[in-house]
Interface confidence: medium
């Protein structure tokens, strides 16, 4: 459509298979945890549900059964509130507003950026540049840091992180110099946007998400592959340096693909 300048990340959650579930830490038990729910986003593991009255937001753990994350009744900017984790779990009948969703300052008692980055050992914390951060607004930009999760609640409801599976990519080898540049190749931008939104969503186990395979200049490598699922290898395809699929190279997952003659680097 008109105006669709960028190829935005497409993130579809895949079913939680045995392999994914096998990597989960044992879930918390009572009395600390009265109800278990699936992690936010595409997470497969179980974590404690938030209880009635607990602070919540777009990127926090889920409210318990029968509860919904809502802005406070007098909240002037509901979208901003939810984006910033300033909602609360209440009876599911009422609807909220946008302020909660916007960029915001960390609330007192929330996990600080340094703590979050210290706790996160996955690709998301290594690659997403500091420029992808959120602001103060009714619709606050999604927070790249999970500062919406209260420290106090973290004691009851630990998040069980699962690292991204390692990929054959140079994405972690970008120099700090290139990180400071405002110019990136299209692959690098797609990767950042994908990881950025995943981080917003607190998706710590994004199985099924295609994080593109980039060269050091931020362009697409010739060969792109979907992530493997257990013993089943993800299918691969060939692209040019701008990520456009090249005809005649799509294996549809049947065989391995060789992109030898493709000019993409």
């Amino acid at each position: 459509g008109a105006g669709a300048v960028g190829a935005g990340p497409v993130v579809r959650c895949e079913p939680c298979d045995a392999r994914a579930l096998s990597q989960c830490a044992p879930p918390p038990t009572a009395p600390a945890c009265t109800e278990l729910v699936r992690e936010p986003g595409c997470g497969c593991c179980l974590t404690c549900a938030l209880r009635e009255g607990d602070a919540c937001g777009v990127y926090t753990e889920r409210c318990g059964t029968g509860l919904r994350c809502q802005p406070r009744p007098a909240e002037q900017y509901p979208l901003r509130a939810l984006l910033n984790g300033r909602g609360f779990c209440a009876n599911a009948s009422a609807a909220g507003s946008l302020s909660t969703y916007l960029p915001s300052q960390p609330a007192p008692g929330n996990i600080s950026e340094s703590e979050e980055e210290h706790n996160a050992g996955s690709v998301e914390s290594q690659v997403v540049p500091s420029t992808h951060r959120v602001t103060d607004s009714k619709f606050h930009p999604l927070h790249a840091k999970m500062d919406v999760i209260k420290k106090g609640h973290a004691r009851d409801s630990q998040r069980y992180k699962v690292d991204y599976e390692s990929q054959s990519t140079d994405t972690q080898n970008f120099s700090s110099e290139s990180k400071r540049e405002t110019e990136y190749g299209p692959c690098r931008r797609e990767m950042e946007d994908t990881l950025n939104h995943l981080k917003f969503l607190n998706v710590l186990s994004p199985r099924g998400v295609h994080i593109p395979n980039c060269d050091k200049k931020g362009f697409y490598k010739k060969k792109q592959c979907r992530p493997s699922k257990g013993r089943k290898r993800g299918f691969c395809w060939c692209v040019d340096k701008y990520g456009q699929p090249l005809p005649g190279y799509d294996t549809k997952g049947k065989d391995d693909v060789h992109c030898l003659s493709v000019q993409s680097q």
């Epitope: 900017y77 909220g96 500091s130 959120v134 607004s137 939104h197």
Partner: antibody
Amino acid sequence: QVQLQQSGAEVKKPGSSVKVSCKASGGIFSTYVTSWVRQAPGQGLEWMGGIIPMFDTTEYAQKLEGRVTITVDESTNTAYMELSSLRFEDTAVYYCARAGGLSHFDYWGQGTLVTVSS
Amino acid sequence: EIVLTQSPLSLPVTPGEPASISCRSSQSLLHSNGNNYLNWYLQKPGQSPQLLIYLSSRRASGVPDRFSGSGSGTDFTLKISRVEAEDVGVYYCMQGLQTPWTFGQGTKVETK
């Protein structure tokens, strides 16, 4: 590739209501802000409000509060904007647009022309 | 609400020459996280707006490198290093720091 497909043009009488749809395909829907932006003939862009489908959370521009309602049907990834008590000055092209975590509209619908005429 | 003021409102350009548009905000758009939540859009005749620049200086995917954004706080600039015929249209700045999200009045760029 994310696409936002809007419903067709409408001609309405003053005092009536109009409901415009915006169907999203090819990307995450529920956690983004789907906003509505309008543009009167020869004029600039005006943000009307938005919704986060996951939480059914809405927010509206103050000048339109009470007249505009934004809803979603998550089963079809479709957002709706209903504007009631239409006035002549509501004649405009109405756009839906998606905003992600960095508060910018990265994808826009093609626009829906709503004409208020007696 | 935050008010954005663009200048000039009309900008006649010569293809191959540089062009510059200013956007001034009624309050700082610099967030404590170091980001400036200022975006630039181009609306070509008969089309939907398209994102050019976000976070003040980050070029959107697919946007030619002749477009660049700069500025911090309340003063921002969009520059086109060498205007091309396809760059004509109305340019809008928009702030994403606070809702209601607001736009500048627009700058109409047309060839001389």
